[in-house]
């Protein structure tokens, strides 16, 4: 597994990570940590593992956290109720 750096699919990344689009270069995917408490997220980001190529630059939230709306267009990882 690639612990950090370029990837193509989730299976190439270590635990607690996903293969997300780089925020600097859209054509590159990098192993990215899953969302921690308070991190920005998107509720439709594919769960881990995803067997295709992601389009989002964020990973889903860590287990035990959910991607919840805090305002009209803002979602963050919060503890599941």
């Amino acid at each position: 597994a690639v612990i950090t750096g370029a990837c193509d699919k989730d299976s190439q990344c270590g635990g607690g990570m996903c293969c997300a689009v780089s925020i600097w270069v859209k054509s590159i995917r990098i192993c990215t940590p899953m969302g921690k408490l308070g991190d920005s997220c998107h509720p439709l980001t594919r769960k881990v593992p995803f067997f295709g190529r992601r389009m989002h630059h964020t990973c889903p939230c860590l287990p035990g956290l959910a991607c919840l709306r805090t305002s009209f267009n803002r979602f963050i990882c919060l503890a599941q109720k």
Epitope: V21, K26, H42, P43, L44, T45, R46, K47, P49, F50, F51, G52, R53, R54, M55, H56, H57
Partner: antibody, heavy 121, light 111 residues
């Protein structure tokens, strides 16, 4: 060749439940999510929900929450849609459709032939 | 829910001419520079068929006379040169917010 083969037409009474099956072949079943969509006679398309065939996690259209259950049997590569408390407005063709794995663009690239569910007293 | 409104409801075009279908979302379906909009074709008695995903990406095996464009709330499906086999109903679908919602459909016929 990817194929999704659905179960046959059903006629149900109001208040009853129906369970529609969708048997997949020609690809690795657990690598792709499965959606369910319905189409009332002469009407447009309505998304019901989808399931991760790998993990079994589901996302439902809130309109159907509490009445719909989507499940998979990995051993037979089959997805199921169960809809309870049927009413006449549920009369429709129900389709299963494979997600194409195009990242977060949840696009349905292969569809079953459809199952007509008629709800009538 | 995001409401998708297609125009026109129906369209009659001569063979070989251009057909244009519009789809307007009640709010933006963009995220992080991508547009989360798909287009499907449905012929009578058949299930829908995916044509375009993520606004402008042509599905494998779909003729290149089909193209998609747009961003934000306004999207277009174009058939550059209408063929007899393109007679169908076309649907847009947003996939940026749950529940995924479809437009009401646009019927394309031969003039």
């Amino acid at each position: 060749e990817v194929q999704l083969v659905q179960s046959g037409a059903e006629v149900k009474k109001p208040g009853a439940s129906v369970k529609v099956s969708c048997k997949a072949s020609g690809y690795s079943f657990t690598d792709y999510d499965m959606h369910w969509v319905r189409q009332a006679p002469g009407q447009g398309l309505e998304w019901i929900g989808y399931i991760s065939c790998y993990a079994g996690a589901t996302t439902y259209n809130q309109k159907f929450k509490g009445r719909v259950t989507i499940t998979v049997d990995k051993s037979t590569s089959t997805a199921y849609l169960e809809l309870s408390s049927l009413r006449s407005e549920d009369t429709a063709v129900y389709y299963c459709a494979r997600d194409g794995n195009y990242g977060e663009a949840y696009a349905m690239d292969y569809w079953g032939q459809g199952t007509l569910v008629t709800v009538s007293s | 829910d995001i409401v998708m409104t297609q125009s026109p409801d129906s369209l009659a075009v001569s063979l070989g001419e251009r057909a244009t279908i519009n789809c307007k979302a009640s709010q933006s379906v963009d995220y992080d520079g991508d547009s989360y909009m798909n287009w499907y074709q449905q012929k009578p008695g058949q299930p829908p068929k995916l044509l375009i995903y993520a606004a402008s990406n042509l599905e494998s095996g779909v003729p290149d006379r089909f193209s998609g464009s747009g961003s934000g709330t306004d999207f277009t499906l174009t058939i550059s040169s209408l063929q007899a086999e393109d007679v169908a109903v076309y649907y847009c679908q947003q996939i940026n917010e749950d529940p995924f919602t479809f437009g009401q459909g646009t019927k394309v016929e031969i003039k």
